[in-house]
C-alpha cells in the first residue's frame, strides 16, 4: 500500500508579513535525502528546488527578492523522496505590508491601568478598509481581527499583567493586504491590590531593520518563530 | 510639568451655544484621553464624556449626549466642549480633566459658566 | 448608572483630629474606587486611587480603605490646609459616577 511522507514545516524569514518591495524568505523542511521540493501559491506550482546532495539537506529556501501584493497569499510546500510524496505542509499566509495608509492606534482608559480595569484598543484608518488587526509583539504573539467602517475596537476585557506589552495595528484590504503599521502603543498593567508584582513581558525577538513591528529569526528560534507565525495565521483563516 | 488651561468664566444668554476651552501641556496631548466634568454647587460631579485626541473617538454620559460636543484641536493641544441651548441648569463650573496614570490625576482650573439673560 | 452616596455632606472637626469619609456604591465597583480634593478655591486633586493607593504627592495622613461597595477616607491627623470638600468616583463602569460631596470645615 502507498503511503505519505510526513508533511513538511513551512515558515517565512524573517516575518510573514513583509513591507512591500522587501524580501522574504519562505523555507520548506522537509527529510534528509528528498530529492525535489515544490512550493506551492494559491494552489498552483510556483516554485521547484533540488537539493544536491539530496541526503545532506533536510531543508530549502525560495527566495522573494520584491514583494508585493501579487506576490501575498497562502502558500504550501510538499516534497519528494524516491517517487514517494509528502503530505503538503500547513498553509502559510504571506502578507505584504505598508500598503497605502497608517492607521493610528489608541487605548482606553489610557496606557497605564491596574489589573481588573476594563481595556479597549481602538484602531483607526480613514481609507477604505473594514478590517482591522491587532498585534501584540512577542513571541507568544496574540493577533485579533476587528470589524468597523472606519475604526475598529478591541476589548481585551479586564486585563491582567499578562496583558502588558507593546501592541500594533494594521488595516486590512484583504487578508493578505495590509496597511503600514500603527505607531506602537505600550501597554503597562500593574498588579491589584494584593498582588502588586509586575509580570515580565513577553519575550521579543530583537528589532530589526524594517521596523519593530517585524522580529527577526536567529539561529535556533526558528521553529518558535513559525509558530508564532502559525498562531497568526490562524486568525486569517 | 502638566498643565489644564481653561478660562475663568463665560456669560452666555439662555438658549446660546457656548464653547469652552482647554489648552494642555507638559505631555503627549494624543496619547491620554481628555475628560470634561460638570460642578454645580452643591449638587456633585457628573461626568459628561471624554475624546481621544489622537482619533477624535468620544465616549458620553447619556445624559449630555445632545448638549455637549467634545471635539480637539491636535495643532494646539487644545480640547472644546461645545454646550448647546443653554438654559439655568448649565449654570455650572465645568472641568477637563486627564488619566494620566491610575485615575483622574491632573485637572484643569475650571470654566463658570453663568446663563442668564 | 452606579450611584455614589456620602451620607454627611459636611463634617466639623479639630485641628490634629481622625476624620473619616464614607462613601457607599450603589453596586460592587471591585475596589475602583477614587478620592477627589476640591478646595474652596475651586482646584481639584487627586488624593487616592484604586481604594487606597495613594497619588504621588499626597501627604501619608492621608489613607482609603474599603470593599465592595463601602469604602472610606481617613485623615489622620487634620490639617489647616485639609480644609475643602472631598468627593469619591468610581472608576468601575462607564459613566465614571461621583459622590456628592463632604464639605470639611473647623470647629
Known amino acids: 500500500q502507498q503511503q505519505t511522507l510526513p508533511k513538511p514545516f513551512i515558515w517565512a524569514e524573517p516575518h510573514f508579513m513583509v513591507p512591500k518591495e522587501k524580501q522574504v524568505t519562505i523555507c520548506c523542511q522537509g527529510n534528509y535525502g528528498a530529492v525535489e521540493y515544490q512550493l506551492h501559491f494559491e494552489g498552483s506550482l510556483f516554485a521547484v528546488d533540488r537539493p544536491k546532495p539530496p541526503e545532506r539537506i533536510n531543508k530549502v529556501k525560495f527566495y522573494i527578492p520584491d514583494m508585493n501584493s501579487r506576490m501575498a497569499g497562502q502558500y504550501s510546500c510538499i516534497y519528494r523522496v524516491g517517487e514517494l510524496w509528502s503530505e503538503p505542509s500547513n498553509l502559510l499566509d504571506l502578507v505584504v505590508t505598508e500598503m497605502y495608509d497608517t492607521p493610528t492606534l489608541s487605548v482606553h482608559p489610557g496606557p497605564e491601568v491596574i489589573s481588573g480595569e476594563k481595556v479597549t484598543f481602538y484602531c483607526r484608518l480613514d481609507t477604505a478598509t473594514s478590517m482591522f488587526l491587532l498585534l501584540k509583539e512577542g513571541r507568544s504573539s496574540h493577533v485579533q481581527r476587528g470589524y468597523g467602517k472606519v475604526q475598529a475596537e478591541f476589548p481585551l476585557g479586564p486585563v491582567t499583567t499578562a496583558h502588558r506589552g507593546t501592541y500594533r495595528c494594521f488595516g486590512s484590504y484583504n487578508n493578505h493586504a495590509w496597511s503600514f503599521p500603527s505607531e506602537p502603543v505600550k501597554l503597562l498593567v500593574t498588579g491589584d491590590i494584593e498582588n502588586t508584582s509586575l509580570a515580565p513581558e513577553d519575550p521579543t525577538f530583537p528589532a530589526d531593520t524594517w521596523g519593530t513591528y517585524l522580529l527577526t529569526t536567529e539561529t535556533g528560534l526558528q521553529k518558535d518563530h513559525a509558530l508564532w507565525d502559525h498562531t497568526a495565521q490562524n486568525l486569517l483563516r | 510639568q502638566v498643565q489644564l488651561q481653561q478660562p475663568g468664566a463665560e456669560l452666555v444668554r439662555p438658549g446660546a451655544s457656548v464653547r469652552l476651552s482647554c489648552k494642555a501641556s507638559?505631555?503627549?496631548?494624543?496619547t491620554y484621553w481628555m475628560h470634561w466634568v460638570k460642578l454645580r454647587p452643591g449638587q456633585g460631579f457628573e461626568w459628561i464624556g471624554e475624546i481621544n485626541p489622537g482619533n477624535g473617538g468620544t465616549n458620553y454620559n447619556e445624559k449630555f449626549k445632545r448638549k455637549a460636543t467634545l471635539t480637539v484641536d491636535k495643532s494646539s493641544s487644545t480640547a472644546y466642549m461645545q454646550l448647546s441651548s443653554l438654559t439655568s441648569e448649565d449654570s455650572a463650573v465645568y472641568y477637563c480633566?486627564?488619566?494620566?496614570?491610575?485615575?483622574?490625576?491632573?485637572w484643569g482650573q475650571g470654566t463658570s459658566v453663568t446663563v442668564s439673560s | 448608572d452606579i450611584q455614589m452616596t456620602q451620607t454627611t455632606s459636611s463634617l466639623s472637626a479639630s485641628l490634629g483630629d481622625r476624620v473619616t469619609i464614607s462613601c457607599r456604591a450603589s453596586q460592587d465597583v471591585r475596589n475602583f474606587l477614587n478620592w477627589f480634593q476640591q478646595k474652596p478655591d475651586g482646584t481639584v486633586k487627586l488624593l487616592i486611587y484604586?481604594?487606597?493607593r495613594l497619588h504621588s504627592g499626597v501627604p501619608s495622613r492621608f489613607s482609603g480603605s474599603g470593599s465592595g461597595t463601602d469604602y472610606s477616607l481617613t485623615i489622620s491627623n487634620l490639617e489647616q490646609e485639609d480644609i475643602a470638600t472631598y468627593f469619591c468616583?468610581?472608576?468601575?463602569?462607564?459613566?465614571?459616577?461621583f459622590g456628592g460631596g463632604t464639605k470639611l470645615e473647623i470647629k
Open positions: 484604586f481604594t487606597s
Open positions: 480633566a486627564i488619566r494620566l496614570r491610575f485615575a483622574l490625576d491632573y
Open positions: 468616583q468610581q472608576g468601575n463602569t462607564l459613566p465614571p459616577t
Open positions: 507638559g505631555y503627549t496631548f494624543t
